[in-house]
């Protein structure tokens, strides 16, 4: 079914994202984000 | 730049520490792993120092291997050693988040060879 | 523990031909892998990073592919200064344990 499918790729997604945000913690960005300016 | 010093010839049993020197960037904002290379074998990852500060091993480097750092320097501690621990050690540099290939750094290594 | 798993262990190819290098990870890694040459004496050297990025300097012969669990080292148009030992290296996440990394076992490229 593909809700099914499509459900399935974004929940891979959002753990692929938070992989990635994990992993930056550890290895540090290349780019630092500036804090803006309220 | 990195490299590596302090390998040398110890009998088992024998603790050794392996220190990474580093130069021309800094420490706070790059990891650094230590991986190990058994003569003609194959490369096996040790741990990673994260730049924030916290590291993490392989499982079965946990307890025997510690790595810490300075404001240049990366140490590796080692206890208990083995034959099995003889290998050359490498210091490498690690890619940051949205970093590219320059990134990667390899030291020459420093051969430690563990016998009686 | 993330486990590597590098096919074939050896594989011998002719100037100019093709060689495929299987990665396998015992669990998901998304993109997470890199993959290097090594030759005797040397350090490792950085091919490929991001399971498909190429890093710089390096031919564009050297090609990357795959996400999840299965990955692959394409070398096209075979030189004979690709006669080396190639390594996967696989990086992941665990809720448990935290960051983690292991190495495939390594695939020897003989040019003939």
């Known amino acids: 079914h593909s809700d099914g499918i499509f459900t399935d790729s974004y929940s891979r997604y959002r753990k692929q994202m938070a992989v990635k945000k994990y992993l930056a913690a550890v290895l540090g960005k290349r780019y630092k984000q500036r804090v803006k300016n309220k | 730049s990195v490299e590596e010093s302090g390998g040398r010839l110890v009998t088992p049993g024998t603790p050794l520490t392996l220190t990474c020197t580093v130069s021309?960037?800094?420490?706070?904002?790059?990891?650094m792993s230590w991986v190990r290379q058994a003569p003609g074998k194959g490369l096996e990852w040790i741990g990673i120092?994260?730049?924030?500060?916290i590291t993490y091993y392989a499982s079965w480097a946990k307890g025997r291997f510690t790595i810490s750092k300075t404001s240049t320097t990366v140490d590796l501690k080692m206890t208990s050693l083995t034959t099995e621990d003889t290998a050359t050690y490498f210091c490498?540099?690690?890619?940051?988040?949205?970093?590219?290939?320059?990134?990667?750094?390899w030291g020459p290594g420093t051969l430690v060879t563990v016998s009686s | 523990a993330i486990k590597m798993t590098q096919t074939p262990s050896s594989v011998s190819a002719a100037v100019g031909g093709t060689v495929t290098i299987n990665c396998q990870a015992s669990e998901d890694i998304y993109t997470n892998l890199a993959w290097y040459q090594q030759k005797p004496g040397q350090p490792p050297n950085l091919l490929i990073y991001?399971?498909?990025d190429l890093a710089s300097g390096v031919p564009s012969r050297f090609s990357g592919s795959g996400d999840g669990t299965q990955f692959t080292l394409t070398i096209s148009a075979v030189q004979c200064e690709d006669a080396a030992t190639y390594y996967c290296q696989g990086v992941a996440w665990s809720s448990n344990t935290g960051y983690g990394s292991a190495f495939g076992g390594g695939t020897e490229v003989v040019v003939k």
């Open positions: 490498t540099r690690e890619i940051r988040d949205d970093g590219d290939s320059s990134d990667k750094l």
């Open positions: 021309g960037f800094s420490l706070n904002n790059y990891a």
């Open positions: 991001d399971a498909s």
């Open positions: 120092m994260g730049v924030n500060d």
